[in-house]
Amino acid sequence: CDLPQTHSLGNRRALILLAQMGRISHFSCLKDRHDFGFPEEEFDGHQFQKAQAISVLHEMIQQTFNLFSTEDSSAAWEQSLLEKFSTELYQQLNDLEACVIQEVGVEETPLMNEDSILAVRKYFQRITLYLTEKKYSPCAWEVVRAEIMRSLSFSTNLQKRLRRKD
């Protein structure tokens, strides 16, 4: 499956939108930095077949979409930017879903990377727990925004490697 060129443009647009969403000085939030244990090894792209990589990417984008679709998120961010960001993620999900079906086959379940998908889900559970513990404070959201920018950058790099393999 060849992800359309618009997909990588969408990736960049999502990162730009996320960068624009910042509302307070980041310097005031240093004390709130947190190690969420991003599963970097799931995004290095070496041990994966393409089908596995695509389903991990899909999970990453899906979880990001879910995180920024909550009521708490709506209260934290400027609405028009949030809507544009969610639209970009939704388009990426559609692209990836088409690829998952094509690569894995409609009947086949990608059991081989359940651990990888679970690692991504647990990562987002830790992010949600952190936000809850910090009572969804502005600084907590800034830290999460910075973390998601970093994890989306890893996703973008994995997609670039997948395209080079084609």
Epitope: A19, G22, S25, H26, F27, C29, L30, K31, D32, R33, H34, D35, F36, F38, E142, V143, R145, A146, E147, M149, R150, S153
Partner: antibody
Amino acid sequence: EVQLVQSGAEVKKPGESLKISCKGSGYSFTSYWIGWVRQMPGKGLEWMGIIDPSDSDTRYSPSFQGQVTISADKSISTAYLQWSSLKASDTAMYYCARHPGLAWAPDFDYWGQGTLVTVSS
Amino acid sequence: DIQMTQSPSSLSASVGDRVTITCRASQSINRFLNWYQQKPGKAPKLLIYAASSLQSGVPSRFSGSGSGTDFTLTISSLQPEDFATYYCQQAIDLPFTFGQGTKVEIK
């Protein structure tokens, strides 16, 4: 490959102005902050200040506030440190280094090679 | 500003020795502490971040520990290339202050 490349050594007279640079490459320049560190001859490291190139938000150490100006041009992935009126006591090696901001990653993991500034009459 | 105090300011040791450098913060910095190595004429190099995380590419003989106000950098078996000056730095609040440095010299 991540690199921070600083401008070359400078010899200046007291009262002159100066702007030194730090060019980032091999990574997303706006995703990392850039910090500046001074090291006077035979002395330790002194933290001067930091800039977020994404919006040019800047903070200075009280010791350097009003003495220097930190800026950045994200279109050319370059941060700057400048003086409007140099003093002999500004003679030092100046380093830039990148910081991951609020994301969880190693702090100041890449450094420039340093710019030696000599101020002498 | 948070003050960082390193001890000792210098030490002499032999190859193979176990070396310990301590760093104390004037107030709690949680685990937001970095350790750097600097050799003459070179830029500092990050060894340890977040008090105990080993930076990629740094030999495992280097380790860091501590939280709150008291921190330690340990070199388990000193190698010839380890003779240098070591600095701690707090990273919880601006300005990010450094310790005054510890020079490790050959005995």
